[in-house]
């Protein structure tokens, strides 16, 4: 955490006044992932690089904020800056992946959440409790509402998992912790399977 934020800030501080203005304009029209809201135009246009970085992280969290910044920079033709962010993203991903592999097991890779995606979609019934545990710290208000709007537990879990690709290790650990609190026997069962 924090590394992606610093990388976004570095990139934005490298932009000229006109480029920063163009970045903001593109941010107003860029295609957003489902469940994410747009930063209000009025506030956005007045922001300097520091404020904009804070807003990007606050609205989209670090991982997706980084990705979105890369997308806009590429769209502006600033490939070199985008590549620098790509490096940060890959390094963060490598750290997260390395940290999530249990030391005693090389046969299995990936986080519990990724390993047991299908089982969790099928078997988690108390989804609202899980959502409440993730609200704000992992899920934005928009994402939270988007998941809760689904009608069945399975659809809610599918929607929740649609956001997982942009999560870092901390976010996945938060989901696992919530599952341990709300569905302890399910987690124990899956850990032993």
């Amino acid at each position: 955490m924090g590394r992606a934020r610093d990388a976004i800030l570095d990139a934005l501080e490298n932009l000229s006044g006109d480029e920063l203005k163009k970045f903001k304009m593109k941010l107003l029209t860029v295609q957003l992932r489902e469940g994410y809201g747009r930063i209000p135009r009025g506030a956005l246009l007045q922001m300097d690089a520091i404020d904009l970085t804070d807003k990007l992280v606050s609205y989209y969290l670090e991982s997706y904020g980084l990705e979105l910044t890369m997308t806009v920079l590429r769209d502006m033709g600033l490939q070199e800056l985008a590549e620098q962010l790509q490096t940060t993203k890959e390094e963060s991903g490598a750290v997260a992946a390395a940290a999530s592999v249990p030391a005693q097991s090389t046969a299995r890779t990936g986080h519990f959440v990724d390993q047991h995606r299908q089982a969790l979609i099928a078997r988690v019934t108390e989804v609202d409790g899980v959502l409440d545990a993730l609200h704000g710290s992992v899920l934005t208000e928009g994402q939270y509402q988007a998941v809760r709007a689904e009608t069945t537990s399975q659809d809610k879990m599918r929607k929740l998992f649609s956001f997982v690709p942009s999560w870092n290790l901390t976010c996945k650990d938060s989901l696992l912790q919530a599952l341990k609190e709300i569905h302890p026997y399910l987690v124990m069962d899956l850990e032993q399977s």
């Epitope: 804070d54 969290l61 670090e62 989804v127 409440d132 609200h135």
Partner: antibody
Framework: EVQLQQSGAELVRPGSSVKMSCRTS????????ITWVKQRPGQGLEWIGY????????EYNEKFKDKATLTSDTASSTVYMQLNSLTSEDSAIYFC???????????WAQGTTLTVSS | DIVLTQSPASLAVSLGQRATISCRAS??????????MHWYQQKPGQPPKLLIH???NLESGVPARFSGSGSGTDFTLNIHPVEEEDAATYYC?????????FGGGTKLEIK
Amino acid sequence: EVQLQQSGAELVRPGSSVKMSCRTSGYTFTNNGITWVKQRPGQGLEWIGYIYVGNGYTEYNEKFKDKATLTSDTASSTVYMQLNSLTSEDSAIYFCARLDRGRALDYWAQGTTLTVSS
Amino acid sequence: DIVLTQSPASLAVSLGQRATISCRASKSVSSSAYSYMHWYQQKPGQPPKLLIHLASNLESGVPARFSGSGSGTDFTLNIHPVEEEDAATYYCQHSWELPYTFGGGTKLEIK
């Protein structure tokens, strides 16, 4: 023991800004959100917004979007609320409170009284 | 915004009797699992205090004479038997969607 402690009363001029603080202790600061609530003398409660400290994620009541800015400092386990372009309508007690699971407000600070007067 | 209408605005109840406060939401604040409605007590010069979270869950340290019920749009706070120290203003609050809103309050007086 969970505790929230707010900064002291403020008397400010119309048109100016003020920044009040809410210092927390007794729990892992980054795990919860902090909400701010406004109460005018003899009136009800109005929800201003919240900040999740771990990631700086904020949401505001549309009514306060141009009035309030929430920030946090993890090193001192403190959340701040800045109010700008103050008018007499902003004179009130402002409370910070911890967001619990389900977003109930389980611990409250004592409140900061803001008086806007020329 | 979801509007929460509390009734009555004030009530006077004799010591040992039951006080019933109602809170009606302008739209449902319940999912299949939870009702996102909470109840607070506020005494003069003090911050509000959480009594009940998620419609019916008593906060730890709150006397068992307080109870909450309801789902969808209609919620109730009951106090029985009422004690002297219960004289206060009571507020309901939802956390279903932004902005979270509070009811207008109900002032309870002990006769």
